[in-house]
């Protein structure tokens, strides 16, 4: 039988007359144009809702735009537009909310042709009021803000000047001409490029890396002939274009740009790009695009110095520079990433690693499902997930892979079962242990969101009929129970819920077509008496993650320990709550080989465990450049990977000497970076 | 019922061999790691060592590694023991236990204990 | 080696009182720590396993809490039949350990 309809699928009890009383209807009294909703805040229910209407004249196009707010998660929204003096926004711009819960909000207008400068509207109390502010440029992107203090902002305009504003957008300073890109790093720092003669364009290859500290009072120049430049976790990367050719390489800082390594990964050229596709504090993960238009590269993974890279997977879908890939962090388990790998007949499989990028292998087959077409052996064949790639091919396919730090082990995506992703219309399947096991939890292409931190799940099925029936789960996706919320079926264009998979409210967004007017409507569905208590010890039972044999005493090491978590009970029916904090245990584990990468001058063979010396360096001493000094290298083949927290064991030695000379192994050399100040 | 029963204790000069049995009845033994754990005379519970159900995975104390030897007969439900090069620290009460099928799992059924004395 | 430390080593109680005994690890050990009873001239049985979940047929009167390093086994009201040792197990980590017993006596 179906998912959901065994006889064991115990139902909630009376749940029709428990939604019905919390089902909030709002119909938007607007032309249904396009509309973008924000959520101001963490837990303060205050949501805000855009809707622009353009109409194209014969010369220009008029648009107008309304500005809604909510307080309640959605259930009931006020018409705001006049506190913004009926100003149509520019959709492109959307709606820059402050990080945190600063309740800080930019909305940049539209002006008129002829204006000196652009026009914002700033509110700092959760968007009740709004203050309009005359800009002394036009901003070319969104308002930025600083991650360490919401007061701090920086936009670019449309003529390359970097614009910094110390008081929420009080005032603006233009701190520098000619930026062509602009980031806030670490302690209000800003990274930015500058070209010298033509243009962004014009000097790609040739830009300058700048730094200020102090908001602009002061510059220090810290790369030169940039190609480009990215922030992840605590690494700063620059691609530098090499002195005799075409060519360019990844150099690396982990100090703010004062000093620079070149990372040991391939050169790119013109037609190539490299794109980091995960970082964190330990450790990044890099695409390196493979020449010709071949649409697959090579990942790579970083020591804790961003410097020695291991390969990690070969043929990785990247279809063009900021083209698509699959490339997916799994939030609800530590260390598992899901992508899609190009095979030699052009088809697409996907691809799991549970060990940040070590190893990776194909999907486990789901119990519940038969092999497709695709498949050569009808008993042998693997679940291939639907992400980026296949939505960017129009693929009937409505939403990327899903997964909530809160939730732990839940995944949710589209998926079919063969030997590669197949065209067919997908199924919608689960894994309740981070990607191990996997089950078919929906049939056909649905909408889906994880609400009460993985206490209930919600879905919608994708159709282009209009809708009015909603899917709930309160066991994981086991058993679902339908809901009908309108009587009058809508056109659905959205779910929404608070970000972060703790609220208990959803939104369906769609809208209803009459014969002569379209209207915006929203329905916001509050689960709480659904899950009618509160969640108590023993709802919770302990749970082993990447547990693959629970008779080996190694069972569930990655990365040198193992985490036990308490999860809600499939079987328990109540609230995890809105303050629930996931709780796991570590344990350390003892060192193996499998906790070590291999060293600078070492590769290992496939399907081996040892590094050996790669061939061309055998018998040289390893001598290497880091920070502009020659380094002297004793080894024997084995780094330890960046996080890895094992201890005893296996224990490699191994010993880096300085051996006090200078050199130059990279672009970026202390002696070319310079300092100045306004 | 759930049982195991241990056999194969005596006394044993230092030096010698023993070799320890345990017969399992009242569940399925091949699905199970067993262990053997051992109580010298007035004091506390030492583990020995354990071997998974298809004895892929065994394991010792550093007490008794190159002495002992664990191994298990599912079809016979029966879990052994060889005890060599005995040393008197090595007297005790020495118990069959089976591990639960949970990871990290807890030792949910025991023996009732035979009897090592090594002594000259 | 991870060192399991019990304390008291001994505890004389009068029935119905509750008993505490407390079991401290060397390291984390998570949840994977379990309690054993043993009365005289027996052989152990499982009390709680995972620190808190009490094995099938026990008196409803033990109970087990804690994680990580710092473990507590109760015996709520005391009974006559409950004098015996009592010992903690951790099946974290490699070697398996046992803490060194609580003797628990009827006053």
């Known amino acids: 039988s179906a998912p959901g309809e065994d006889e064991e699928c115990g139902r909630v009890r009376d749940f029709v007359a428990k939604l019905a009383n919390n089902t909030h209807q709002h119909v938007f009294d607007d032309l249904r144009g396009s509309v973008s909703l924000s959520w101001v805040g963490d837990s303060t229910g205050v949501i805000l809702v855009l809707t622009t209407f353009h109409v194209p004249l014969v010369i220009m196009t008029f648009g107008q735009s309304k500005l809604y707010r909510s307080e309640d998660y959605g259930k009931n929204f006020k018409d705001i537009t006049d506190l913004i003096n009926n100003t149509f926004i520019r959709t492109e711009f959307g709606m820059a909310i402050g990080p945190e819960n600063s309740g800080k909000v930019v909305l940049t207008a539209e002006v008129s042709g002829g204006s000196r400068g652009g026009r914002i509207f700033r509110s700092s109390d959760f968007a009740k009021n709004f203050v309009q502010t005359d800009l002394p440029f036009h901003p070319l992107t969104q308002m930025m803000y600083s991650p360490q203090n919401s007061d701090y902002l920086l936009a670019l305009s449309t003529e390359n000047g970097l614009w910094v504003s110390k008081n929420f957008g009080g005032k603006w300073e233009e701190i520098h001409k000619a930026v062509c890109l602009a980031k806030w790093g670490s302690d209000n720092t800003i990274f930015f490029t500058t070209y010298a003669n033509g243009s962004c364009k014009a000097d790609l290859g040739a830009l300058e890396l700048w730094r200020t500290s102090d908001l602009g009072k002061s510059f220090k120049t810290i790369g030169v002939k940039i190609y480009s430049f990215g922030l992840g976790g605590r690494f700063l990367f620059a691609s530098v274009m090499a002195d005799k050719d075409t060519t360019r390489r990844i150099h690396v800082s982990t100090d703010q740009g004062d000093t620079w390594s070149m990372a040991q990964l391939p050169s790119v050229g013109q037609e190539q790009f490299y794109s980091i596709l995960a970082a964190n504090d330990d450790m990044v993960f890099m695409h390196v695009d493979e020449p010709g238009d071949t649409g697959f590269g090579t990942i790579f993974t970083s020591d804790d110095r961003g410097i020695v890279y291991s390969k990690s997977l070969d043929r990785h879908l990247y279809t063009t520079t900021g083209g698509e890939t699959d490339f997916t962090n799994v939030t609800s388990l530590r260390g598992v990433y899901i992508t899609s790998v190009l095979s030699e007949d052009n088809s697409i499989q996907t691809m799991i690693t549970f060990d940040q990028g070590g190893r990776w292998t194909h999907l486990r087959k789901p119990e519940n499902s038969e092999c497709d077409a695709t498949a050569k052996n009808k008993n042998e064949c693997s679940l291939h997930i639907h992400a980026s790639y296949s939505i960017s091919q129009k693929l009937n396919v409505p939403m990327a892979p899903l997964s909530e730090p809160n939730a732990v082990g839940i995944v949710i995506a589209h998926g079919s079962v063969g030997d590669a992703i197949s065209v067919m219309v997908p199924d919608v399947y689960i894994s309740d242990d981070g990607g191990y096991s996997w089950t078919k939890m929906l049939e056909g292409p649905h909408y889906y969101t994880i609400l009460d931190s993985g206490g209930i799940i919600v879905a919608i099925e994708h159709s282009s009929r209009p809708i009015n029936v909603i899917k709930f789960s309160t066991d994981e996706g086991q058993c679902w129970q339908t809901y009908t919320f309108t009587r009058d079926p809508i056109y659905f264009t959205g779910l929404a819920s608070e970000p972060g998979a703790r609220s208990m409210n959803i939104s369906i967004w769609g809208f209803t077509e009459s014969f002569l007017t379209s209207q915006w409507v929203s329905y916001t569905i509050d689960f709480k008496d659904i899950l009618e208590r509160n969640c108590e010890e023993k709802d919770y039972t302990i749970w082993l993650a990447h547990s693959t044999d629970p008779e080996d005493y190694e069972d569930g090491c990655i990365l040198g320990y193992k985490e036990q978590f308490l999860r809600l009970r499939k079987s328990s029916v109540c609230q995890n709550g809105r303050d629930y904090v996931v709780t796991k245990q570590p344990s350390i584990c003892l060192c193996s080989l499998e906790d070590f990468l291999c060293d600078f001058g070492y590769y290992r063979p496939e399907n081996d465990s040892k590094c050996v010396e790669q061939p061309e360096l055998k018998g040289h001493d390893l001598e290497f450049c880091l920070y502009g000094r020659e380094e002297h290298l004793t080894t024997n083949g084995y780094r330890k990977i960046p996080g890895d927290k094992c201890q005893g064991g296996v224990n490699p030695v191994r010993e880096v000497k300085d051996l006090k000379k200078k050199c130059t192994s990279n672009f970026l050399s202390p002696e070319k970076q310079n300092s100045k100040s306004n | 019922e759930v049982q195991l029963v241990e056999s194969g204790g005596g006394l044993v000069k230092p030096g010698g061999s023993l070799r320890l049995s345990c017969a399992a009845s009242?569940?399925?033994?091949?699905?199970?790691?067993m262990n053997w754990v051992r109580q010298a005379p007035g004091k506390g519970l030492e583990w020995v060592s354990s071997i998974s159900s298809s004895s892929s995975y065994i394991y010792y104390a550093d007490s008794v590694k190159g002495r002992f030897t664990i191994s298990r007969d599912n079809a016979k439900n029966s879990l052994y023991l060889q005890m060599n090069s005995l040393r008197a620290e090595d007297t005790a009460v020495y118990y069959c236990?089976?591990?639960?099928?949970?990871?990290?799992?807890?030792?949910?059924?025991w023996g009732q204990g035979t009897m090592v004395t090594v002594s000259s | 080696e991870i060192v399991l430390t019990q304390s008291p080593d001994f505890q004389s109680v009068t029935p119905k009182e509750k008993v505490t005994i407390t079991c401290r690890a060397s390291?984390?050990?998570?949840?994977?720590l379990h309690w054993y009873q043993q009365k005289p001239d027996q052989s152990p049985k499982l009390l709680i396993k995972y620190a808190s979940q009490s094995f099938s047929g026990v008196p409803s009167r033990f109970s087990g809490s804690g994680s990580g390093t710092d473990f507590t086994l109760t015996i709520n009201s005391l009974e006559a039949e409950d004098a015996a040792a009592y010992y903690c197990h951790q099946s974290s980590s490699l070697p398996l350990t046992f803490g060194g017993g609580t003797k628990v006596e009827i006053k």
């Open positions: 009242g569940f399925t033994f091949s699905s199970y790691s």
């Open positions: 236990a089976r591990r639960g099928s949970g990871s990290y799992d807890a030792f949910d059924i």
């Open positions: 390291q984390s050990i998570g949840y994977s």
